[in-house]
Each structure stands twice: as C-alpha cells, then as structure tokens.
C-alpha cells in the first residue's frame, strides 16, 4: 500500500484558535476525525469538499474538523480565543514571496511587474486564452491573481488588462530574500520552512520521519512553530529536520538583514549596566567575578583551557575579559586568572528593576491592590475563585475576599515575600508576581534580628535515627550532579526535596542534573551500598533576590542510616551569637592532591552589625542574610560548595539555618561568611512542600 | 545523536605518516569540539589533541606536539588527524570524541566528551 504524504507541514498552526464567520454566506465543512493529520490530509486534496480548502480547525474535545474555504486574512471572517481549538491554515494562501518558480504561489497580488492590473483568468478580454480555472484544479486560477500553473521559469504571472501587453511576470519575491536573519539567527522567528537544497522541513512537534528531541512544548523560548527554520542549539545558522527520510537535518538559506532591517523579535535585551532575565544580553564591562578575583580573557587559553572561545560564540559578544553569559547559565560569568578557580559567576552585578511602571507594595505587600496579574515567570494568573479550595489548604483564617477580585496578584496568606498567585499550571501551582517593594518602604517583614526571641529549633527532644544519635550523621547532605560530575551541595529537608542555591544550575536541561545521596566521597568510592542516584524533576526558585532552589526529586528519597532529612528552623528566629556551626562540602579545598572526601568546616554565629563591622563596613545585612566566622583562619565555604547548608545545633537539634551561595568570599581570613537565612524563607519552604505535588514512592 | 566513525588506522614503520579520519554524522549540538584521545596496551586512554569546529584554537598533548596536525573539513564533516614521525610509542588504539562546548572541563579531559568513536588500531613497527 503507498504511503500517503502527510501534508500537515504545508499549514501555519495557531494554538487555541479558531475561525468565526460573521458573513452568513461562507460555507464551511465539518466531520469527525481522530488527529490533525487527517483534516490535514483532506483539505490539501481537497477531497468530497464542495470549495477549495483554505483552512481547517481542529476541535481537540470533540475530534473533529472544521474545514474552510476562507482563512484569518479574508473578509467576513474573524478570530477567536478557544481552549479545545487549533487552526491550522494552508501556508501557501498566506504567504507573500515565492518558493523555487512559485508554482505552489496562491497569494493575491493581482499587478503586474510594470505596475499593469492583472486580467481575471476567467475573462477573456482584453486577452484570449486557455488557462481556465476548470482547465486547471488545484492551481487556484482564482480572480486575477498572480500564478505559475505551470511552473515556468520567469515565476508568477498573469494576462494584463493592458490590450498592448499580453501577459508580464509579477514582482514577487523569493522568500530567501524576504527572510532575514541577525548574527546566527537564534532569535530568528521568520517563517522559511524549507532548506537550501528546497527540501521541506519537519514539524517540530512531529516525530516522523526523524525522532528529535526539540519539542515545543520542552522548549517554549525555542520558536519552534510548524516546520519553520531555527537554530536552537548555537549552529553556525538556522536549519531543520527534513521531510526526506534518508536526509536528517540541513541548513535553510536565510540571509542577514542590513543593519536597517534587523526585526528579530527575540534578542535578549542588551544592557550594560545591570542584568536582565539570565544576563545573555548583558554587554557591560565588569571584569571580574564577585569576590574581585579578574576574569581571564576569552581569546586566551591561559591559565585555563577552554572551547568557549569568541569564534565559537560570534553574537555573544565575548570580547576582552568582560562578564558574559554565551551558554544560557545562570548568570554571567567568566574564566578567572586563578589557576585553582576555573569559573565564577559575576553575581555583583545588580539586576535591571524588573518592576511593571509605578507598580510597587509596602511592607510585605498584603494590602497591594494594583491589577497586576502575571507571575514573574510569565504565567498568567488564575482566578482566585478558582482557587479558594487550595488557599483554604495552607492558610488558618478566612481571606478577605473583596480583595482577591479577579486574577489580581495578591497576597492573601501574608506571605513575607510579596503578591503571589495561582497559575492554573499543575506544575506552578502558584508563585510570585514581578512587583518590587516601593522605594524607601524599610517596613521590616521580620522584626529584632539580633535578639533570640524566636527560638529556631522545634522540639528539645534529641533526635535519634536507626540508634545514631543525628549528630554523627549527615546522611542529609546531597551531592548534585551537572553532567555527571559533582558541582554543588545540597540539604535533603524532605523526602522528596532538596535545598540548594539557584547558582548550580548552569543548563535549563533538567537531564543534565543528579542528585547524589549517602555519600562521603564526591565520586561514590566505597559508598555503592549506601548510595542513592536520583534524578531531578523540578526546580522552584526562590523569592526574588534569594538565591535559593528547592529541587524537586524525581522520586523520593529512602530515609535509611546513610539518608536523613535535616529539619528547617522556625521561621524569622534568631539564633545566639557565638553558636557554634558547621559548614559541608565537597568544594575545592585549596590542596593539589584533594581526597575528594566530605570536609566540614566550623563556624560560630556573629551578629550582623558586627559582621559589617569585619567586612570593614562595605557590606550591609538585612533580613534574609546570617553571618558566621570561622574559628581558623582560613577555613570556610568555597566554590563548588555552593548550595550546601550552615548546620547549627540549638537543643539538641541540628537545623540548617543557612545556605551557601556565591557572592562574599571564599574563606578569606578575618573576613566571616555571610549565608543565605533559611528562617527568613522558612514560611516559603514550607508553602512549596505543602503546595507542589510531588512523585509517590 | 552523533556518530563518529575513525578509519585510516594500520601498521606502519617507525618514521611514517598515517592520516587517520573521523566522519561525524548525525547531531545534538553545535559548534562542536572535536578531539584524538589513544589507548596503549595495559594503559589509560589520554588525550592526543583537539580543535574547535571552526579551528580557531588546537591543543596538543606534549608528546606529539610538532608532529600531530588535527584539521577537518567541514563541509565533509570530516576531521583528521594527521601523524608524521611516528614512534613505536604511538602504538594504541585512536579514538576520535565530540563535546559540545562548555566552562566545567578543558578540552584535553576525557569526561569533558560525551560521544566517541568505536577506534582504529595504529600500529608503528620499530
């Protein structure tokens, strides 16, 4: 039996939409279907429909198609939000340029290349001729439209309605000219959908003929609509998988725009003073990385060996030895110039206000009524009625209702880091909206910093697992993995979730990352019985400014002799100054021949005025920030300990009461390390755990 | 995904030239980092040398620096490795990697390589 061609690839997609025709005369026709492909099928054959299809709609709920003999250009018709609905419309009765001799051309330019009106095909006046539009099905001989019914070689062209000139060719471009493209062309969002050699290009979102793993749905930020031409992964230009089984993947012939014409829509905003998003479009001059140490220049392979080298990256602006972020990490970063430090981010750098307008809160923002209603990630909000069943969940009072109108950002459970809402995304159930606090607004969401009013620890029982009293046991301490080797710490605080520091997440590929468990070497020598591997599934970052990730396991971890939890504190407690606490890591340690054992380094608790006061008065703690010095000098948390905890002991109970993150020095003498304050974000912590679903076990 | 395929391995006599090829078909990722790494018997598998898609930067490994050249044609997606003054020494089996690059390895790391070749055995005759 012959393999039908699959001809979904001739069509524009348009997610959640449908077709509407306000004129009562448009014909339309609908059938019960199983898959897109079909209504595909039908519309380009044209087959038992009484018009020459244009389009179609596909009704996902109902399996069903609708198709159309008019599209969203034409009159009389008009577009309309649906859930259930994708439209689909055939690309040639859109596009404005040609493909090859423009023979599939089906377009309404109608005037000829000296400017002549275009005779109707079906006129024979001024001109005799035998191009009827019976003559020819399929060719769409429609009105008096440029064609190329039989793909001669000058491309589109009609009778004229001059009597002087018989038939002119049509001024219509190619569409590799039309297209253009910056740099590489990876904010490249035309819509070429064939490659240099004319062959047609694969949907992305289909599987056949070649297996990819570049779906949209894992890729949103991609463009990868329909079959178009993208260059998703840093290529030299866009390319696509090809409908030829024995041909994968090729080049598209897109030209580069003159400096005039650049319309890329997805550049990433250039700024030099301060970061916005990840930083990718970060072009300042910082030089050096945030303790100070200078970067290495990027056209230098001294004193570290590297690929990332300015040819390698053209449009990522790699000159001299400046901060910049070519692989989508974090933030931006460099090479340094010390031999023992390969990279280090420039977290220095402060971040562009993200704020929308004059949009700002008090305090922690409970009583924020602007009408803000999309979540910093981008995700439109849900609505509150919606939602109360859930809110009810995790908060011990009534809200008050006349303030959760609509889908409004808010923050009905008093939550200390701002308005929040539901997305309606089971993944995100919920999370913070892009509003700042308002400037000058110094209401402090948690009051007396140094003083213990607040104890930080839940019980005075001594905890005791499988006989081990827990303080001999850091089976809560988690090894995480970015492409097999380790390159953070991390806190088991439940089974199922990890607390570490948003900086150890390089690649937004959720593949590319492990976490090890039960572990005391960084390479699981000797630890095969007590090991556990477990791949990760989300991530949920912090409020803004955190620094912290909670990390979703893919499955939940076995608490076992070699696995703990470790508990989190009371939030907004304070815990004594001069405490003695303990840091862990993995991270280099300053020696050539590293074991690559566990190293615990402690600590002791210091005031935050007179951490400022060691930090000879450049840095100032707030609220989210602890402090604590080292009881050697020289001893302390380091890169590649990132993300581990600063585990304190209060009645008997360990608690990890701060997360190490970069950003204030790497066991510099004399000079205490300053952490990220779990209590501040204890509240978080738990919202996320009672709120996000995770996987049973 | 990446395929490597070496070819162009064989005896030959201490002093000799070979020129061993890498075609690389299919692909995740890009610019690559194309890299020679060889084990001898009874030995680990090291690094021999690398250059970067474009080859606007080469590494060597000291041993065969001067006498080694890594090139490719790209239009081809071929990369070579081209061995001149051979010693008994150079015996092993070559094996030509593929990275993507990335800020954690050097070039010259084994684990820096995500996709390898199968090998092809040269043998240099004192």
């Known amino acids: 039996q012959r393999k039908r061609r699959n001809t979904i690839h001739e069509f524009k997609k348009s997610a959640k939409t449908t077709l509407i025709k306000i004129d009562p005369a448009l014909k339309i026709k609908t059938k019960k279907v199983n898959t897109a492909d079909q209504c595909a099928n039908r519309c380009t054959r044209n087959k038992g429909l009484p018009f020459t299809c244009k389009a179609f709609v596909f009704d996902k709920a109902r399996k069903q198609c609708l198709w159309f003999p008019f599209n969203s250009m034409s009159s009389g018709v008009k577009k309309e939000f649906g859930h259930e609905f994708d439209l689909y419309e055939n690309k040639d009765y859109i596009r404005n340029c040609i493909i090859g001799k423009g023979r599939s051309y089906k377009g309404t330019v109608s005037i000829t290349k000296s400017g002549i009106k275009c005779q109707p095909w079906s006129s024979m006046i001024p001109h005799e001729h035998s191009f009827l539009p019976s003559s020819y099905r399929g060719k769409d001989l429609q009105e008096n439209y440029c064609r190329n019914p039989r793909g001669e070689e000058g491309g589109p062209w009609c009778f004229t309605s001059n009597p002087e000139v018989r038939y002119e060719v049509c001024d219509i471009p190619q569409c590799s000219e039309v297209e253009c493209m910056t740099c590489n062309g990876e904010s490249y969002r035309g819509l070429m959908d064939h490659t240099e050699s004319g062959k047609i290009c694969q949907r992305w979102d289909h599987q056949t003929p070649h297996r990819h793993k570049f779906l949209p749905e894992r890729y949103p930020d991609k463009g990868f609509d329909d079959n178009y031409c993208r260059n998703p992964d840093g290529q030299p230009r866009p390319w696509c998988y090809t409908l030829d089984p024995h041909t994968r993947w090729e080049y598209c012939a897109i030209k580069t725009c003159a400096d005039n014409t650049m319309n890329d829509t997805d550049v990433p905003l250039e700024t030099t003073e301060c970061i916005q998003g990840q930083g990718e479009g970060y072009r300042g001059t910082v030089n050096t990385i945030w303790n100070g140490i200078p970067c290495q220049r990027w056209d230098s392979q001294y004193p570290h060996e590297h690929d990332m080298t300015p040819e390698n990256f053209k449009c990522k602006d790699l000159r001299e030895n400046y901060c910049r972020n070519p692989d989508g990490s974090e933030s931006p970063w460099c090479f340094t110039t010390d031999p023992n430090i390969r990279v280090g981010y420039c977290s220095q750098i402060p971040n562009c206000d993200m704020s929308h307008g004059q949009d700002c809160y008090r305090g922690n923002g409970k009583n924020y009524m602007g009408n803000l209603s999309q979540t910093r990630s981008g995700l439109t909000c849900s609505m509150w009625d919606k939602n109360m069943e859930d809110l009810h969940r995790h908060i011990f009072w009534e809200p008050d209702a006349s303030k959760l109108n609509e889908n409004y950002c808010r923050n009905p459970d008093d939550d200390a880091h701002g308005p929040w809402c539901y997305t309606g995304n089971p993944l995100i159930p919920w999370d913070y909206c892009p509003i700042s606090r308002c400037e000058g607004d110094t209401t402090p969401t948690i009051v007396n910093l140094d003083h213990p009013v607040i104890s930080c620890a839940k019980t005075k029982q001594l905890r005791v697992v499988n006989g081990i009293p827990t303080r001999t046991n850091i089976g809560w301490m988690v090894s995480l993995r970015y492409r097999n080797k380790h390159i953070c710490g991390g806190s088991l605080i439940k089974e199922s979730w990890v607390l570490t520091a948003r900086q150890c997440f390089p690649s937004r590929d959720l593949k590319d990352y492990e976490a090890w468990l039960g572990i005391h070497d960084v390479h699981g020598r000797g630890d095969e019985k007590c090991k556990q591997v477990l791949n990760v599934s989300q991530l949920v970052y912090g409020p803004e400014g955190s620094d912290l990730v909670l990390m979703k396991l893919a499955r939940p971890a076995v608490l076992d002799d070699f696995v703990s939890t470790i508990d989190l504190p009371n939030y907004g407690c304070t815990i004594p100054e001069k405490t003695s606490c303990s840091v862990y890591g993995w991270g280099y340690t300053g020696l050539i021949n590293y074991d690559g054992l566990l190293r615990v380094a402690h600590l002791y608790i210091m005031g935050n005025e007179k951490c400022s006061q060691h930090h000879r008065g450049k840095v100032t703690l707030n609220e989210s920030e602890i402090c604590a010095g080292a009881e050697k000098i020289g001893s302390g948390p380091c890169e590649g300990d990132y993300g581990g905890p600063l585990v304190c002991e209060q009645h008997k109970m360990r608690m990890v009461l701060g997360v190490i993150v970069p950003g204030r020095g790497c066991a510099i003498p004399n000079r205490p390390g300053i952490f990220v304050r779990v209590a501040y974000y204890a509240k978080w912590i738990h919202k996320i755990i009672l709120t996000y679903k995770v996987p049973q076990s | 995904e990446v395929q490597l395929v070496e070819s162009g391995g064989g005896l030959v006599q201490a002093g000799g030239s070979l020129r061993l090829s890498c075609a690389v078909s299919g692909r995740t990722f890009s610019p690559y980092t194309m890299g020679w790494f060889r084990r001898a018997p009874g030995k680990e598998r090291e690094f021999v040398a690398a250059?970067?898609?474009?080859?606007?930067?080469?590494w060597y490994a000291d041993s065969v620096k001067g006498r080694f050249t890594i090139s490719s044609d790209n239009a081809e997606n071929m990369v070579y490795l081209q061995m001149n003054s051979l010693k008994p020494e150079d015996t092993a089996v070559y094996y030509c990697a593929a990275k993507s690059p990335g800020r954690t390895y050097s070039p010259r790391e084994e684990r820096a390589y995500a996709r390898w070749g199968q090998g092809t055995q040269v043998t240099v005759s004192s």
């Open positions: 250059r970067t898609w474009s080859g606007g930067v080469a």
